[in-house]
Amino acid sequence: MKVTGIFLLSALALLSLSGNTGADSLGREAKCYNELNGCTKIYDPVCGTDGNTYPNECVLCFENRKRQTSILIQKSGPC
């Protein structure tokens, strides 16, 4: 029983070290709170899961709304 518990803890530790898993590995949702007040011109690029570079998260949110899409952020910085 104790061995099984240690094994499970070890497995969980390994999973947490290996980073995001499952659906999260596809990307994260853009934070859209700024978009409600209009996007700024600040250049803080993100790479979308569509392979396009967006100048900032707000612009990605804007396009998701206008195009009724669900593009996620696969990484910070340009694609």
Epitope: G38, C39, T40, K41, Y43, G48, D50, N52, T53, Y54, P55, C58, V59, F62, E63, R65, K66, R67, Q68
Partner: antibody, heavy 117, light 110 residues
Amino acid sequence: QSVKESEGGLFKPTDTLTLTCTVSGFSLSSNVISWVRQAPGKGLEWIGDIYVSGNTDYASWAKSRSTITRNANLNTVTLKMTSLTAADTATYFCARYDMSSDAFDPWGPGTLVTVSS
Amino acid sequence: AYDMTQTPASVEVAVGGTVTIKCQASQNIGSYLSWYQHKPGQRPRLLMYRASTLASGVSSRFKGSGSGTEFTLTISGVQCDNAATYYCQQGYTNSGVDNTFGGGTEVVVK
């Protein structure tokens, strides 16, 4: 900040229309550009947009025969519309779609396109 | 399909009077609604955005209100220069849309 359409002119039915919108005072790499038209005696009609990402959207009626492209280096956006008919006779406008206000501003002066045999 | 319906199609108003134009969206568009003034031979002019925010340089005699599906543009103290066609436009989405603009309202000033 301003936008201006290239000269329109007289076209024949089935011809392909190519119009260019030249922008100044802002960058295409961080702005949305839209095309809108107005037929004689009719209202404003949205044609399509090209987004910051390069993605495009078109009105459902325009989708099958319209293409919007851009050249960020030349600060130009091009509208190509195929299979023209007399119903495409209109003044064509390009406009910046302002992401901060969610509105078309500024607009170009417009250019008249006439389709007639 | 986010259709925009404007009423009336045409309205006559005396100088100094008040005119009210209504715009109805077929689906909820929040406050993503703009108003434009368009005169023959000119480029359209942005009057109002986000339903009630006055665009730069626009007279405070123009007032926008509403949210969701029902919107109104009111022009008070109408002047001859206000004779034009006014359009509403939804900015919520372009997906599956025929036209983002309403059909327009012609304002005739007596």
